[in-house]
């Protein structure tokens, strides 16, 4: 899965739009089997704060064990703690578990900085707040890991939603996603509504706040305010997608679009930033630095390093630039942006020294895996992952954090030509990513 | 321009109580908070808390808590700082400074207020 | 509580000199640290604050470098009337605490 920040924390050529406006194929989605519009068994089913990641209640084995799990769409095995570890309250115990079997084969899965390995095996597997059906879904027990569990995360494993390709220890270990899909009626498909508190919440104010919502199967309509609109997912490995153009406050960025996908683009619930390749990083700090230059940050800030704090109450929201990524839509020639707000990309962070402080990190950072829509940028919206579809749709997060004056949006269509060049095609040498 | 000013020097007797004022002008007010720093004779400068001038709340170092009060008069620009019981340990002067917008550095202070507690 | 400790009390120099000024933290305070110039019978006044940023009209000949743990105050060109106490702060960690300062005299 990506790194930097990466959950688990180890912390163009796109044309103007036009004012062209061109039809959408329906005004609605039309209702799919299995789509309906209220899922409230599921709503409300996340707990977590998007620099620790988001989790869902999960059982593993028989009788059931109950597990905290990380919900990651960009990482493929589900792994729990099944051995004693200083940051765990709890861990699976095969032995107890009647229905484990083992694969006997091992997995490693090394990152920039950490790792974990464990013991295949399988066994069946549930989600209390999700579809009432159990499964039998491959497991890997980790057994020794490296700065992968957080303290005080309240999470005991991570369940990745991506596809199998980027699976651990090859493509033959079947996802979870994939399992439940084939075992049961659930649809393929699933939505994430992950709610930013907008400001820092300490450990029992976690575990007693709603997080957001994981609805599989599904869209739940309460969850989003507006229209879905969707990309395509270019390629099933991570959930990847073409950005054609990037503006900060209306402002084009005006790079190569291919810039913006370099190497990829990627929606990804277990990072916490919104990461940017090198060269688009630093022409949106740059803008952003100019939009706020009435405020005298210190370097660290834009470096993610240091966080800074205005008296509780004042910070200046109105300084700071919307950012407006341009996806490619799903029809020849139609993009459709998203917008972001400094509410989502400058993190609340907790100071020690007193709660009358308003304190922030800036949370885009530099990436040289490509751009990761990380967090941040989930916490601004509804995101479904249309895997049947092969596309990734987005609306206004019925619970996203703004202020009187401006919101999060999803707005379309616009015209933008040549998208398809904007993608970046890895030379097929490449190994995967997971280590950079 | 940013200006403080406080008030005029004090001679207290131990048990009594003081008041500082401490008046801000040139900026808005509300958007900086207020911090309290004293300097005792042959001491270390001490910050001892501060106030958000927004929210009203004060914040007190462990070593400023009980005998020691914040307050605000928003309208009038105006901060205060109250020593109640005061003792000989308490003479010092006493600073009002505006807490910097992005941290706790001070950026303007007021002139000081000489506090002489004696018998 | 973290400690700012300014190991030297007194700094000789003369007009024109270039003078370095020390400060150094107990833990790791990034680079929350602000120095201040306090002249006789006057307040204190901010020099430099997130170690090296020069507060509104400071002169350029004063110059903050430093993170971490080490932080260093220079005057280049020191003129007659920087002749003063100079202390540095930091406001990592609560609660915010100053060093004891260094005074530069005349040679």
């Known amino acids: 899965t990506q790194h930097g920040i990466r959950l688990p924390l180890r912390s163009g050529l796109g044309g103007a739009p036009l004012g062209l406006r061109l039809p959408r194929e329906t005004d609605e989605e039309p209702e799919e089997p299995g789509r309906r519009g209220s899922f409230v068994e599921m709503v409300d089913n996340l707990r977590g704060k998007s620099g620790q990641g988001y989790y869902v209640e999960m059982t593993v084995g028989s009788p059931p064990q109950t597990l905290n799990i990380l919900v990651d769409t960009g990482s493929s095995n589900f792994a729990v703690g099944a051995a004693p570890h200083p940051f765990l309250h709890r861990y699976y115990q095969r032995q107890l578990s009647s229905t484990y079997r083992d694969l006997r084969k091992g997995v490693y899965v090394p990152y920039t900085q950490g790792k974990w390995e464990g013991e295949l095996g399988t066994d069946l597997v549930s989600i209390p707040h999700g579809p009432n059906v159990t499964v039998r879904a491959n497991i890997a027990a980790i057994t020794e890991s490296d700065k992968f569990f957080i303290n005080g995360s309240n999470w005991e494993g991570i369940l990745g939603l991506a596809y199998a390709e980027i699976a651990r220890p090859d493509d033959s270990l079947e996802p979870f996603f994939d399992s439940l899909v084939k075992q049961t009626h659930v649809p393929n498909l699933f939505s994430l509504q992950l709610c930013g508190a907008g400001f820092p919440l300490n450990q029992s104010e976690v575990l007693a706040s709603v997080g957001g919502s994981m609805i599989i199967g599904g869209i739940d309509h309460s969850l989003y305010t507006g229209s879905l609109w969707y990309t395509p997912i270019r390629r099933e490995w991570y959930y990847e997608v073409i950005i054609v153009r990037v503006e900060i406050n209306g402002q084009d960025l005006k790079m190569d679009c291919k810039e913006y996908n370099y190497d990829k683009s990627i929606v990804d619930s277990g990072t916490t930033n919104l990461r940017l390749p090198k060269k688009v990083f630093e022409a949106a700090v740059k803008s952003i630095k100019a939009a706020s230059s009435t405020e005298k940050f210190p370097d660290g800030f834009w470096l993610g390093e240091q966080l800074v704090c205005w008296q509780a109450g004042t910070t200046p929201w109105n300084i700071f630039p919307v950012i407006s990524l341009y996806l490619m839509g799903e029809v020849t020639n139609q993009s459709f942006r998203i917008t972001i707000l400094p509410q989502q990309y400058l993190r609340p962070v907790e100071d020690v020294a007193t709660s009358q402080d308003d304190c922030y990190k800036f949370a885009i950072s530099q990436s040289s895996t490509g751009t990761v829509m990380g967090a941040v940028i989930m916490e601004g919206f509804y995101v479904v992952f249309d895997r049947a579809r092969k596309r990734i749709g987005f609306a206004v997060s019925a619970c996203h954090v703004h202020d009187e004056f401006r919101t999060a949006a999803v707005e379309g269509p616009f015209v933008t030509l040549d998208m398809e060049d904007c993608g970046y095609n890895i030379p097929q040498t490449d190994e995967s990513t997971l280590m950079t | 321009e940013v200006h403080v000013k406080q008030s005029g020097p004090e001679l207290k007797k131990p048990g009594e109580t003081v008041t500082i004022s401490c008046k801000a002008s040139?900026?808005?007010?509300?958007?900086?908070?207020m911090t309290w720093v004293r300097q005792a004779p042959g001491k270390d400068l001490e910050w001892m808390g501060w106030?958000?001038?927004?929210?009203?709340?004060?914040i007190y170092a462990d070593d400023f808590k009980g005998r020691f009060a914040f307050s605000l008069e928003t309208s009038a620009g105006t901060a205060y700082l109250q020593i109640n019981n005061l003792k000989n340990e308490d003479t010092a002067t006493y600073f009002c400074?505006?807490?910097?917008?992005?941290?706790?550095?001070?950026?303007?202070w007021g002139q000081g207020t000489s506090v002489t507690v004696s018998s | 509580d973290i400690v700012m400790t300014q190991s030297q009390k007194f700094m000789s120099t003369s007009v024109g000199d270039r003078v370095s000024v020390t400060c150094k933290a107990s833990?790791?305070?990034?680079?929350?640290v602000a120095w201040y110039q306090q002249k006789p019978g006057q307040s204190p006044k901010l020099l430099i604050y997130?170690?090296?940023t020069r507060h509104t009209g400071v002169p350029d000949r004063f110059t903050g470098s430093g993170s971490g743990t080490d932080f260093t105050l220079t005057i280049s060109n020191v003129q007659s009337e920087d002749l003063a106490d100079y202390f540095c702060?930091?406001?990592?960690?609560?609660?915010?605490?100053f060093g004891g300062g260094t005074k530069l005299e005349l040679k």
């Open positions: 400074t505006r807490r910097g917008r992005l941290g706790h550095y001070f950026d303007y």
């Open positions: 040139g900026y808005t007010f509300t958007t900086y908070g």
């Open positions: 106030i958000n001038t927004h929210s009203g709340v004060p």
């Open positions: 833990q790791n305070v990034g680079t929350n």
């Open positions: 997130w170690a090296s």
């Open positions: 702060q930091q406001y990592s960690s609560y609660p915010y605490t």
